[in-house]
């Protein structure tokens, strides 16, 4: 009679994490009598995975009924596979012996690889806001995938970016891997509505990549442009001075009016108008009682935007150009009329 052979037909199998793995093994003879054992690995360090005769192996079930007299199928099913289960599994036939069974023949082994999906990519931007024309860095991280091969791409508003560096860790063997990528993005004034997208493609995702996004609205600061203008008002001795604050982002803005360098009023922006590009406009105005002034007046609109150093724009009000009211020298009254800021775009 021909000598028993242990046949493991699958050289390798690949299983998704969480699923069951079936490891096939058949023998070609019922002789010699003795049990089958399954090991992960070979040599003195191999790990026992299943023993037909004894032991408790809660995740392992046999495919066939091993109690049947002429059973020759010793395939096993391992449930709830994790990346830690990867390795080469050997089906080993033992010959009955006393006191111990004696190893008789081993199958050629089945390499089990475990596919694990990457976690949803998390994109994070810089801690502080930056202004247009500056380059900022975004990071993207995804974890827990196997095998190691993975593809990562960056996009800004659908356009692929090329300035990025990607690392997959660890460099050596591991049950699962992580990817970390840093992309550099140049900001423009139009980026308030822009998005940066990190896209991860992996064999486990069946062609449907995972995406992580970051809104540039969280990153960008568009400083305002200021314009101070004056228009005459009906009353001869009053002038309307407006400060147009245009194209700024984010909304946080405080405006201070100064009269010849002295603070006259401070207000916080409200009732903003939003532009198509996501930036905001705001206007503040003052009624200036010209008759209250003997000399020219320097009016300054000072804006502190998003906690940044203040920017200002000044306007010289020529007092000589306006006729003065009688008695203005003795009882000038308030130089600046108490005017609420006007909403509206400039």
């Amino acid at each position: 009679e021909e000598e028993l052979q242990v046949i493991q037909p699958d050289k390798s199998i690949s299983v998704a994490a969480g699923e069951s793995a079936t490891l096939h093994c058949t023998v070609t003879s019922l002789i010699p009598v003795g049990p089958i054992q399954w090991f992960r690995g070979a040599g003195p360090g191999r790990e026992l995975i299943y023993n037909q005769k004894e032991g408790h192996f809660p995740r392992v079930t046999t495919v066939s009924d091993l109690t049947k007299r002429n059973n020759m199928d010793f395939s096993i099913r391992i449930s709830n596979i994790t990346p830690a289960d990867a390795g080469t599994y050997y089906c080993v036939k033992f010959r009955k012996g006393s006191p111990d069974h004696v190893e008789f023949k081993s199958g050629a082994g089945t390499e089990l690889s475990v596919r694990a999906k990457p976690s949803a990519p998390v994109v994070s931007g810089p801690a502080a806001r930056a202004t247009p024309q500056h380059t900022v860095s975004f990071t993207c991280e995804s974890h827990g995938f196997s095998p190691r091969d993975i593809t990562l791409k960056w996009f800004k508003n659908g356009n692929e970016l090329s300035d990025f560096q990607t690392n997959v860790d660890p460099a050596g063997d591991s049950v699962s891997y992580s990817i970390h990528s840093t992309a550099k993005v140049v900001l423009t004034r139009e980026d308030v509505h822009s998005q940066v997208i990190c896209e991860v493609a992996h064999v486990t995702l069946q062609g449907d990549p995972l995406r992580g996004t970051a809104n540039l609205s969280e990153t960008i600061r568009v400083p305002p442009t200021l314009e101070v203008t004056q228009q005459p008002v009906r009353a001869e001795n009053q002038v309307n001075v407006t400060c147009q604050v245009r194209k700024f982002y984010p909304q946080r803005l405080q405006l201070t009016w100064l009269e010849n360098g002295n603070v006259s009023r401070t207000e916080t922006a409200s009732t903003l108008t939003e532009n198509k590009d996501g930036t905001y406009n705001w206007m503040s105005w003052l009624l200036v009682n010209v008759s209250a002034h003997r000399d020219d007046v320097k009016l300054t609109c000072q804006v502190e935007h998003d906690g940044q150093p203040a920017v200002s724009k000044s306007h010289d009000l020529k007092v000589s150009a306006h006729p003065k009211e009688q008695g203005s020298n003795t009882a000038p009254g308030p130089a600046l009329a108490s005017a609420a800021p006007l909403g509206g775009s400039g």
């Epitope: 992960r40 070979a42 040599g43 003195p44 360090g45 390795g87 082994g109 063997d173």
Partner: antibody, heavy 122, light 112 residues
Framework: QVQLQESGPGLVRPSETLSLTCTVS????????WSWIRQPPGKGLEWIGF???????FYNPSLKSRVTISLDMSINQFSLKMTSVTAADTAVYYC????????????????WGQGTTVTVSS | DIVMTQSPLSLPVTPGEPASISCKSS???????????LDWYLQRPGQSPQLLIY???NRASGVPDRFSGSGSGTDFTLKISRVEAEDVGVFYC?????????FGGGTKVEIK
């Protein structure tokens, strides 16, 4: 192909600890045993011990009390630490890969580092 | 521990001629699965050892077919069918059946 590179100090003082690292490049740690073997000047080869990729270690009983082999798969390195060294530990130390295809035995030490000379002297 | 004994200690050879080295183990290296766990290595002068034969008779990848291994149980032989100048060095046998792995004392092959 797979290459092994030993690194560590060439001179160790008596009673101190010898520490060597072997870096594996061009291949996987998985499914192999990773061995340390030494050769005193003008003498034969002596097996120190090895570690399997699953972390199981095996040591030469004559050195077991002084030897620790560890493995860091994430950086493809394994290490040897030998405490309380004496002049008798002066040798060329080799790191090597051992194959295991079936059964309880081993199927050849098929890749060797170039060896690093360690001298124990005060 | 399994003790490995090699002979001869030194082997002067003539290029083109055959050569033979013996290795004996203190216990059988033939495992119940039918494999004999014995390796042969060549250490050329100033180099690391190189695997020639594993499991008693299997030639390692890239090893010339002039090298062959035979034997089972406790007696093993390495044969070189036609010695070449590059074969000089020390040949070692090693048992790979159980730990501690043990080497023979080595056979120094040199050109006559």
């Amino acid at each position: 192909q797979v290459q092994l590179q030993e690194s560590g100090p060439g001179l160790v003082r008596p009673s101190e600890t010898l520490s060597l690292t072997c870096t594996v490049s061009g291949g996987s740690i998985r499914n192999y045993y990773w061995s340390w073997i030494r050769q005193p000047p003008g003498k034969g080869l002596e097996w120190i011990g090895f570690i399997y990729y699953n972390g199981r270690t095996f040591y030469n009983p004559s050195l077991k009390s002084r030897v620790t082999i560890s493995l860091d798969m994430s950086i493809n390195q394994f290490s040897l630490k030998m405490t309380s060294v004496t002049a008798a530990d002066t040798a060329v130390y080799y790191c090597a890969r051992v194959r295991a295809y079936s059964g309880i035995g081993l199927d050849g030490t098929d890749v060797w580092g170039q060896g690093t000379t360690v001298t124990v002297s005060s | 521990d399994i003790v490995m004994t090699q002979s001869p200690l030194s082997l002067p050879v003539t290029p083109g001629e055959p050569a033979s080295i013996s290795c004996k183990s203190s216990q059988s290296l033939l495992y119940s699965n039918g494999y004999a766990y014995l390796d042969w290595y060549l250490q050329r002068p100033g180099q690391s050892p190189q695997l020639l034969i594993y499991q008693g008779s299997n030639r390692a990848s890239g090893v010339p077919d002039r090298f062959s291994g035979s034997g089972s149980g406790t007696d093993f032989t390495l044969k070189i069918s036609r010695v070449e100048a590059e074969d000089v060095g020390v040949f070692y046998c090693m048992q790979a059946l159980q730990t501690p792995l043990t080497f023979g004392g080595g056979t120094k092959v040199e050109i006559k």
